[in-house]
């Protein structure tokens, strides 16, 4: 039988939708303009690209990697898409207000494009822990709450640690899990009997999802070194993201084929460990000095990530109510963290050999910045949880999670399409 | 091969008027490197007024010149502009274009700083 | 991060050991860079990264310092080096120069 859209959610989510994208047309018309000045073409081309990159990560990769679910592949690809378009919109206003205001109108640029489709991607990450479960109107509540609040936890880094925008956007990977974990926290959790099913993978999706995964793969450099200030850096960058990810692939599939009694490899294992070593390099991409370094790190995040998978999403499912499939959340959380330690390690090791003092307090320093977005994401995190748990989002009732058909419509209705 | 930069497009012009500086790069690749410009009053110290990243990206600018100066690169060209609208008096000084490089420090961290400077152009905003 | 030198102005002889500091209102790390200009023409980079000496600048220049204190050191005072000396911070926006300290003979 076919189930409807709510009447109240059909209601309430175009008039919520239409009128925020009114209220943001004004916000631009009044508050923003192009960069009047006249480049050299091929520079713009070539700086294009790079936001180009990560707009294929966001819609395409991320897209498609939650797309795993039997019955929630149209939402997963299409809700994502809805969030990156909201959530750019949103970001580009709230950075320009946040860093340009007092000059009066916030300049629009190629970058300010390409930070905002990163603030954005972070959304995308979180939303990972908490689609279908969830309504287009309770996701638009979650890229706003988001975006704000990253770009918040970025401006007051930045202010208070003096990190440039590499360094501050990097947090992104704890920032994303720990909101996305919060929010799931927040959410209903029990399945109800004879749903089960629908958190479960199938075939077509899996594949879909393995696409996700190979093009977050093949632009994970991009979206690493998209915020180094000199081309050095972000070729140092590249070549490292490129090293840990190539790497972090071949600990996948044979980690994943180890971790299986009858050494069968897992498509969910597989997913989410290729893109370990660019999670796990991320903040510290341009600082480590030679490949091999690199490739440990690669290695070690996708045994992290297979290890990760194989005894967390029991403990997930429970706590959490996060389904199996939707391991991002504390895939990335434990893989932010590595990264965020190895730069901390890098840091002493560069003080020490160039013979500086105040080790100490650089790495207070760094553990501080770290602390921050941690807390930042887990209040903001339960404040969106909150937020969503209102009656006046008519939330999809827990029978109908996991459910393309409580929000598409389909020529005909068949069970498993 | 010598590093330079050269100013040039200053000169004398009245309050609320519009100026644009250009800066000529050679004996390096330009498109590698950010670009700065910086500013000196008379008697007065350095006052940095905006960079840019090395693809034109980015671009940040001084308080008291938002809105008002603009910073671009044509590196098809090698050069640098500063774009001055709405000149005040106290945007008279000498303007210097600086290359901004990445200096490695330690095992692996760059550190930042402006290492190749021009000679300077003069403007003189007065009515 | 606003940059304060001091002193402002400081008389030397020949062969003296003259030292220059500069505070940071904020941590900058070690992201700190001086300059020496002398009159009519362009600023010269000396220590970029607080402490590291930029090629073809003599020894007895150094530089030390880390968060929110640094410190130029000139060993031994030649007779070139009396000029105009700035402290300049790159951890982050806006750029931000000292008001300078002028070396001069005593």
């Known amino acids: 039988m076919s189930s409807k859209y709510p009447r109240s959610v059909r209601r309430c989510l175009p008039l919520w939708a239409l009128t925020l994208e009114a209220a943001l047309i004004l916000l631009f018309y009044f508050f923003t303009h192009y960069d009047a000045s006249l480049e050299d073409q091929k520079g713009l081309v070539a700086s294009y690209q790079v936001g180009q990159d990560l707009t294929v990560m966001a819609a395409i990769g991320l897209g498609f990697l939650t797309s795993s679910f039997r019955r929630h592949s149209w939402s997963s690809v299409a809700f994502n898409l809805f969030m990156l378009a909201l959530g750019v919109q949103w970001a580009i206003l709230l950075d320009g207000f946040l860093s340009q205001f007092p000059s009066g109108k916030v300049v629009i640029t190629l970058f300010s494009i390409r930070l905002a489709t990163m603030s954005a991607l972070s959304v995308l990450i979180s939303v990972d822990a908490v689609l279908g479960k969830v309504n287009l109107a309770q996701l638009v509540v979650m890229v706003l709450v988001e975006v704000t609040a990253l770009g918040n936890l970025r401006m007051v880094i930045s202010n208070i640690f003096n990190t440039d925008y590499h360094m501050n956007m990097m947090h992104i990977y704890v920032f994303a899990a720990y909101f996305g974990l919060s929010v799931a926290w927040c959410l209903p959790k029990p399945l109800p009997e004879g749903t089960e099913d629908k958190d479960q993978t199938a075939t077509i999706p899996s594949l879909s999802a393995m696409l996700g995964a190979l093009f977050l793969w093949m632009f994970w450099p991009s979206f690493n070194s998209a915020l180094l200030r000199s081309p050095i850096e972000r070729k140092n960058a590249v070549f490292n993201t490129y090293y840990a990810v190539a790497v972090s692939v071949v600990t996948a599939i044979s980690g994943s084929s180890l971790a299986h009694p009858q050494g069968k490899i897992s498509k969910t294992y597989v997913h989410s460990a290729v893109l370990a070593g660019g999670v796990a390099v991320g903040t510290s991409c341009h600082l480590i000095p030679s490949p091999w370094l690199a490739m440990v790190l690669g290695l070690v995040a996708g045994l992290i990530s297979v290890g990760g998978a194989k005894y967390l999403p029991g403990c997930c499912n429970r706590v959490l109510g996060i389904p199996h499939s939707s391991i991002m959340g504390y895939n990335f959380s434990l893989l932010g963290l590595l990264g965020e330690i190895i730069y901390i390690v890098l840091l002493v090791l560069d003080t020490v050999g160039a013979g500086n003092g105040m080790i100490g307090f650089q790495v207070l320093l760094s553990i501080g910045e770290l602390s921050l977005a941690i807390v930042i994401a887990l209040m903001s995190g339960l404040l969106t949880g909150l937020l969503l748990n209102l009656k006046i989002w008519k939330a999809p009732h827990e029978a109908k999670y996991f459910d393309d058909q409580v929000f598409w419509k389909f020529p005909h209705l068949a069970v498993g399409f | 091969e010598v590093q330079l930069l050269e100013e040039s497009g200053g000169g004398v012009v009245q309050p609320g008027r519009s100026l644009r500086l250009a800066c000529a790069a050679s004996?390096?690749?330009?498109?590698?490197?950010?670009m700065h410009w910086v500013r000196q009053a008379p008697g007065r110290g350095l006052e940095w007024v905006a960079f840019t990243w090395f693809d034109g990206s980015n671009k940040y600018y001084v308080d008291s010149v938002k809105g008002r100066f603009t910073i671009s690169r044509d590196n098809s060209k090698n050069t640098l502009y500063l774009e001055m609208n709405s000149l005040r008096v106290d945007d008279t000084a000498v303007y210097y274009c600086a290359r901004e490089a990445p200096m490695l420090r330690g095992i692996s961290r760059y550190y930042y700083a402006m290492d190749v400077w021009g000679p300077g152009t003069t403007v003189t905003v007065s009515s | 991060a606003e940059l304060t030198q001091s002193p402002s102005s400081l008389s030397a002889s020949v062969g003296d050991r003259v030292t220059i500091t500069c505070r940071a209102s904020?941590?900058?790390?070690?992201?700190l860079n001086w300059y020496q200009q002398k009159p009519g023409k362009a600023p010269k980079l000396l220590i970029y990264a607080a402490s590291s000496l930029q090629s073809g600048v003599p020894s007895r220049f150094s530089g030390s310092g880390s968060g929110t204190d640094f410190t130029l050191t000139i060993s031994s005072l030649q007779p070139e080096d009396f000029a105009t000396y700035y402290c300049?911070?790159?951890?982050?926006?806006?750029?931000?120069f000292g008001q300078g300290t002028k070396v001069e003979i005593k």
């Open positions: 300049q911070q790159s951890s982050n926006t806006p750029w931000t």
């Open positions: 004996g390096f690749s330009f498109r590698s490197y950010g």
């Open positions: 904020q941590n900058i790390r070690r992201s």
